[in-house]
Amino acid sequence: QAGPLPKPTLWAEPGSVISWGNSVTIWCQGTLEAREYRLDKEESPAPWDRQNPLEPKNKARFSIPSMTEDYAGRYRCYYRSPVGWSQPSDPLELVMTGAYSKPTLSALPSPLVTSGKSVTLLCQSRSPMDTFLLIKERAAHPLLHLRSEHGAQQHQAEFPMSPVTSVHGGTYRCFSSHGFSHYLLSHPSDPLELIVSGSLEDPRPSPTRSVSTAAGPEDQPLMPTGSVPHSGLRRHWE
């Protein structure tokens, strides 16, 4: 053997963010020489599952018929060929939504904003949470975290945007979470359509899409500006 076996590729269908109760399939793709595929979950002491390869032997399927809290977490896969085990795949983070009640997303002062002005998206939860995530549909980098300092729990998080440009227009949702598991999120908030007027082109309304939908390469990342709000929350980029 000249060197370590190449690492397999690990992914989830229909995506890695799954609502409670929905099904998800984890795929591990290795090589045509694979004899067995193994899936490991972080902090699980035994191999999480193992499967024979599907013909033509270059991948294996790990099925989760109904998503629950127990399945949320960080996974890696391996394959075994006649010369031994491969390197681990890059990790797959499987996130479950629906663990907590949905927060409310609103725009201050209004979801209709003139280009160049400021707007703040406010995500509010009924019970105190320590992490809030803002998601813009069809964004290349959809997750923006605001996480509380020192585990202090908050009922809301502010996401200021200034100055607003046409790039900020679109459909947003937010989630809330507890820090003890980054992989368990609330139900999504109802969508909020942010409409930016006064730009050279009219904003295109975004169709409602599931958070597990892959972003297109042409979409722009969400880029809010301004200082971190005075709420004890710290901004984290994903």
Partner: antibody
């Protein structure tokens, strides 16, 4: 010391079901998968299936998919196998056996400890 | 499924003898071959895993060798406590399969 203590012999009627138990001790129960193996009188060994005590994931031999159901109780460190719609072909000794990694950093997995076996006799 | 053919199905040997049991797989199993001992009372123990690695607590008179499809278990100096049935088992692909067994008796 690793021990797998299996439940006592069973005599059951055709068409009935039976649930066998396997209580593990001497190691961390969730760190090893549990396998079940069948041995008919005077014959070889047949692999029935395996279960991961951490998450209840199972893999079955196709031959036993509609015959055996594997479960675990993590709190008591016990694995179970239920056999349904029993016929004379199911009369056998059934073994539980733990499966895991051998060696500290080696990628070798094998069944390393076995229970004493449970005899099941199907008779009217 | 992979078929393992063990030979002989039974053999008689004298104490102190060197005994060899063979196991042939229906396809290459890449050394994922284990050997088990089943005593007359039904107790099953792992002897050797991955063709030649001795499991902890197993006497050094037991050894294993082979590659590809052909494997063997050797007992170099037969003792009374070795009277048992020996099974090979492949762990290369699911489902794991066993050989038919070799019953070892004293001459």
């Amino acid at each position: 010391e690793v021990q797998l203590e299996q439940s006592g012999a069973e005599v059951v009627k055709p068409g009935a079901s039976v649930k066998l138990s396997c209580k593990a001790s001497g190691y961390t129960f969730i760190s090893y998968w549990m396998h079940w193996v069948k041995q008919r009188p005077g014959q070889g060994l047949e692999w029935i299936g395996e279960i991961n005590p951490t998450n209840g994931r199972t893999n079955y031999n196709e031959k036993f998919k509609s015959k055996a159901t594997l479960t675990v109780d993590k709190s008591s460190g016990t694995a179970y196998m239920q056999l349904s719609s029993l016929t004379s072909e199911d009369s056998a000794v059934y073994y539980c056996a733990r499966w895991g990694q051998l060696g500290l950093r080696e990628g070798y997995y094998a069944v390393d400890y076995w229970g004493q076996g449970t005899s099941v006799t199907v008779s009217s | 499924d992979i078929v393992l053919t063990q030979s002989p199905s039974s053999l008689s040997a004298s104490l102190g003898d060197r005994v060899t049991i063979s196991c042939r797989a229906s396809q290459d199993i890449s050394n994922y071959l284990n050997w088990y001992q089943q005593n007359p009372n039904g107790t099953v123990k792992l002897l050797i895993y991955y063709t030649s690695r001795l499991h902890s607590g197993v006497p050094s008179r037991f050894s294993g060798s082979g590659s590809g499809t052909d494997y063997s278990l050797t007992i170099s100096n037969l003792e009374q406590e070795d009277i048992a049935t020996y099974f090979c088992q492949q762990g290369d692909t699911l489902p794991p399969t066993f050989g038919g067994g070799t019953k070892l008796e004293i001459k």
